[in-house]
Amino acid sequence: TTELTEEKYEYKEGQTLEVKCDYTLEKFASSQKAWQKMEGKMPKILAKTERPSKNSHPVQVGRITLEDYPDHGLLQVQMTNLQVEDSGLYQCVIYQHPKESHVLFNPICLVVTKGSSGTPGSSENSTQNVYRTPSTTAKALGPRYTSPRTVTQAPPESTVVVSTPGSEINLTNVTDIIREQKLISEEDLEQKLISEEDLHHHHHH
């Protein structure tokens, strides 16, 4: 199995998680995309875009909003009013079949904690952006996870430094968190997805 590095993101209750998934390949432009939570070994689909996916047509399921920009190969996921029970492992996927979804990026380990008493931040509507790029060919089922990295929601006016390949990004007010991850090459990703898609088509036709 492909090794995935999960990334830990810490939030307070009431905050908003915003994830941008970068799927790049045109073949996925009109595909359904989904936001899923890993529950045990099985993923639970929380929200899906329409099929075919329409440009910037938001889909809202409860506190989750998916907005796809197929003309730019970008999917935005928002989870508002985060609660402690939202903590868990999340993934953005190309949804082809419940057991055939393709993971677009390393999973997010979301940790939501209660705001400490006396601090106004507990129900604050602050947002942390997480930018994702394709990094693995792993299926949604059964990946092996390595120890998580942690990115903590910083207090206002602070600066977070996030290391990325070949550069360092200074993030003031935690406006953006950019993760350019390349566990394998995009060419390998493309080859794997193509071969899997071919098998899938042969199976059904």
Partner: antibody, heavy 121, light 111 residues
């Protein structure tokens, strides 16, 4: 290794036609949009146009300066992109590069060496 | 069409010194906070070479003295310590909207 090789350039009279080819190898050709970029001698780069993939119905887009005169096509079975140039003008004289992006509206990571088109009487 | 204007048109910098090239777009080249703005280097007789993609991401194999910054309409390419092999013409390019467009280029020379 990704390789793009342009061919078909040469001397043509104003009003004439020419068809350039771009032979691709080292990647799954059908997965990516292909672009043409040109550069007149001593001048800057000018994007000519692009052709998307089958999943995008081979949609094409062009720069205003060539629209209606140039046509981009592709043959995925031959791993080749084409640039059909009609009603050529002297200002079309340039080195024509074939380039491949890294996905939807992404950067041009791969370029051919270019082929020279000279439009002159 | 989105017009990209680079400044300066030419630049002479001493070896080891910092070189800065600017690129201004006539309208935003951002979508979803992603900047679809890229930088290329071109040497005589060669095709362009990708340096920076999406404003600030260093292309694999490109020396880390090159960096990019900016968003929306204003972008900068910086070479932290100029080397002799950096003499070239540099172009910015946007892919946020069709037609894609390039800046007019900035010629970088050694002072």
């Amino acid at each position: 290794e990704v390789q793009l090789v342009e061919s078909g350039g040469g001397l043509v009279q104003p009003g004439g036609s020419l068809k350039l080819s771009c032979a691709a190898s080292g990647f799954t050709f059908s997965t990516y949009a292909m672009h043409w970029v040109r550069q007149a001698s001593g001048k800057g780069l000018e994007w000519v146009g692009r052709i998307r993939t089958k999943s995008s119905n081979y949609a094409t887009y062009y720069a205003a300066s060539v629209k209606g005169r140039f046509t981009i096509s592709r043959d995925d079975s031959k791993n080749t992109a084409y640039l059909q140039m009609n009603s050529l003008k002297t200002e079309d004289t340039a080195v024509y590069y074939c380039t491949r992006d890294m996905g939807i509206r992404r950067q041009f990571a791969y370029w051919g060496q270019g082929t020279l088109v000279t439009v002159s009487s | 069409d989105i017009v990209l204007t680079q400044s300066p048109d030419s630049l002479a910098v001493s070896l080891g010194e910092r070189a800065t090239i600017n690129c201004r777009a006539s309208e935003s080249v951002d979508t979803f906070d992603y900047s679809f703005l890229h930088w290329y280097q071109q040497k005589p007789g060669q095709p362009p070479k990708l340096l920076i993609y999406r404003a600030s991401n260093l292309e694999s194999g490109v020396p880390d003295r090159f960096s990019g910054s900016g968003s929306g309409t204003d972008f900068t390419l910086t070479i932290s310590s100029l080397q002799a092999e950096d003499v070239a013409v540099y172009y910015c390019q946007q892919s946020n909207e069709d037609p894609y467009t390039f800046g007019q280029g900035t010629k970088l020379e050694i002072k």
